[in-house]
C-alpha cells in the first residue's frame, strides 16, 4: 500500500500557511482542484476549490483561503491568512476528476498552529491591493464554491469578478517563514 | 434533475433484518457526492443513519452502527440500507439522500420516503 | 455528539407576520478558515420529505422565496420567514454537518394563529 506522508507546518496565530501542491502538468491543468481538511473520523470537508475548469493564475478566496493554479509549473498554490489556532490540523490538495476518486497531491499537511506574537508582519492588516472573492452561489455544484447546476458536472461558473467586501479583506503578500518537518505514518 | 426512490418491504418481523434500497436518477452515484439514509419514526424528528461514498466509503451514526450497513452498487445506480435485529422502535418513514456534509454541508434531494413497520 | 436544541417546539403565527425559529448547536458548527457555518435548515410538511431551504446557515437554496431568511453564527441561528403565508405551514428542522454524526434539532412546528 502507498504509504501516506505529511508535511508539518509549524505556526503562528496571525501568520500565513502557503504550501505549494505540485501535479502533472500534462494530466490535470485544466482540472478542477480543492484545499480539503480531514478531521479524525470525518469525512474530508472541501473548504475551497478551484474553477472547472481550473483557470490559470487566477486567485479565488474563500474566506482566509487562496487559492491559485499555475498551469505552466503544475503547481496549485494554497495559502491561510490570518491563522487561527482552530485551524489546526490535517490537509491535502485534491484534485477533482469524476467519475475517478479524487486524486490526493502528496503530501499531506499537518498544520499546527499556536498562540503567541509571530513577530513577523501577519496577514490581517489593511491591504490596497485586489481582493479575490467567490461571487455569490445560489445553486449547489460539486465542488460546492461556485454557481453550477448540481445535475451538471462541467459547468464553470460565468465569472469570477473582483469582488472585495468587509469581511476578511486581507493582505496578499505577506507570507511568513515555515518549518517543514516531514513526518511519516 | 437528480431524482431518488426509496424501495423495499413496509413490514418487517422482529429480530429480523430490514433491507432498503434507492434508485438515483438523474445524476451518476459515480460522479461524487456522499449518499445517506435518514428515518423519521412517526411523529417523530429526524435522525441520520449513516452515509457512503461510491467507493465503499462509510460513515454511521454511533447509535446504529452494530446493527447498520450500508453499501452502494454503481452499476445500478442505486446504494442499500441494512439494520438487523429490528425492534418496533426501528419502525419509521426511511428516506434516502444526497449528503453535502463536505460540501455545502446539507442533504439535497430527499427521496419520498417509504414507511417500514416493525411488528410480529 | 452535537446536540441541537430548537425553540420554541411550536409556534402559531398570523398570516403576513414574522416567524421566528431558533436552533442552538452545543458546539460550534463555523469553520472558520472558509467562514462558512455548517448549518442547514429543512422544511417539511406532513407526508413529505423535508425539503432544503437554508444551507451555510445563510444561503438560500434555489427556488426558495425570499421571505425565508437564515442568520447567525457558531452556535446560535435563526430561521426567519419575514411574511407567512398559508403554504408556509410545516415543521421546521435544522441540521448541522459539521462533525458527524450528522445531527439535527427537534423540529419547530409552525401554525396559522
Known amino acids: 500500500a502507498t504509504k501516506l506522508t505529511e508535511e508539518k507546518y509549524e505556526l503562528k496565530e496571525g501568520q500565513t500557511l502557503d504550501v505549494k501542491c505540485d501535479y502533472t502538468l500534462e494530466k490535470f491543468a485544466s482540472s478542477q482542484k480543492a484545499w480539503q481538511i480531514i478531521r479524525d473520523g470525518e469525512m474530508p470537508k472541501t473548504l475551497a476549490c478551484t474553477e472547472r475548469p481550473s483557470k490559470n493564475s487566477h486567485p479565488v478566496q474563500v474566506g482566509r483561503i487562496i487559492l491559485e493554479d499555475y498551469h505552466d509549473h503544475g503547481l496549485l498554490r494554497v495559502r491561510m491568512v490570518n491563522l487561527q489556532v482552530e485551524d489546526s490540523g490535517l490537509y491535502q490538495c485534491v484534485i477533482y476528476q469524476p467519475p475517478k476518486e479524487p486524486h490526493m497531491l502528496f503530501d499531506r499537511i499537518r498544520l499546527v498552529v499556536t498562540k503567541g506574537f509571530s513577530g513577523t508582519p501577519g496577514s490581517n492588516e489593511n491591504s490596497t491591493q485586489n481582493v479575490y472573492k467567490i461571487p455569490p452561489t445560489t445553486t449547489k455544484a460539486l465542488c460546492p464554491l461556485y454557481t453550477s447546476p448540481r445535475t451538471v458536472t462541467q459547468a464553470p461558473p460565468k465569472s469570477t469578478a473582483d469582488v472585495s467586501t468587509p469581511d476578511s479583506e486581507i493582505n496578499l503578500t505577506n507570507v511568513t517563514d515555515i518549518i517543514r518537518v516531514p513526518v511519516f505514518n | 434533475q437528480v431524482q431518488l426512490q426509496e424501495s423495499g418491504p413496509g413490514l418487517v418481523k422482529p429480530s429480523e433484518t430490514l433491507s432498503l434500497t434507492c434508485a438515483v436518477s438523474g445524476y451518476s452515484i459515480s460522479s461524487g457526492y456522499y449518499w445517506a439514509w435518514i428515518r423519521q419514526p412517526p411523529g417523530k424528528g429526524l435522525e441520520w443513519i449513516g452515509s457512503i461514498y461510491h467507493s465503499g466509503s462509510t460513515y454511521y451514526n454511533p447509535s446504529l452502527k452494530s446493527r447498520v450497513t450500508i453499501s452502494v452498487d454503481t452499476s445500478k445506480n442505486q446504494f442499500s440500507l441494512k439494520l438487523s435485529s429490528v425492534t418496533a422502535a426501528d419502525t419509521a418513514v426511511y428516506y434516502c439522500?444526497?449528503?453535502?456534509?463536505?460540501?455545502?454541508?446539507?442533504?439535497?434531494?430527499w427521496g419520498q420516503g417509504t414507511l417500514v413497520t416493525v411488528s410480529s | 455528539d452535537i446536540v441541537m436544541t430548537q425553540s420554541p417546539d411550536s409556534l402559531a403565527v398570523s398570516l403576513g407576520e414574522r416567524a421566528t425559529i431558533n436552533c442552538k448547536s452545543s458546539?460550534?458548527?463555523?469553520?472558520?478558515?472558509?467562514?462558512?457555518?455548517?448549518l442547514a435548515w429543512y422544511q417539511q410538511k406532513p407526508g413529505q420529505p423535508p425539503k432544503l431551504l437554508i444551507y451555510w446557515a445563510s444561503t438560500r437554496e434555489s427556488g426558495v422565496p425570499d421571505r425565508f431568511s437564515g442568520s447567525g453564527s457558531g452556535t446560535d441561528f435563526t430561521l426567519t420567514i419575514s411574511s407567512l403565508q398559508a403554504e408556509d405551514v410545516a415543521v421546521y428542522y435544522c441540521?448541522?454537518?459539521?462533525?458527524?454524526?450528522?445531527?439535527f434539532g427537534g423540529g419547530t412546528k409552525v401554525e396559522i394563529k
Open positions: 458546539q460550534s458548527v463555523l469553520f472558520s478558515s472558509n467562514n462558512k457555518n455548517y
Open positions: 441540521q448541522q454537518l459539521a462533525f458527524t454524526p450528522w445531527t
Open positions: 439522500a444526497r449528503d453535502l456534509g463536505g460540501y455545502e454541508g446539507a442533504f439535497d434531494p
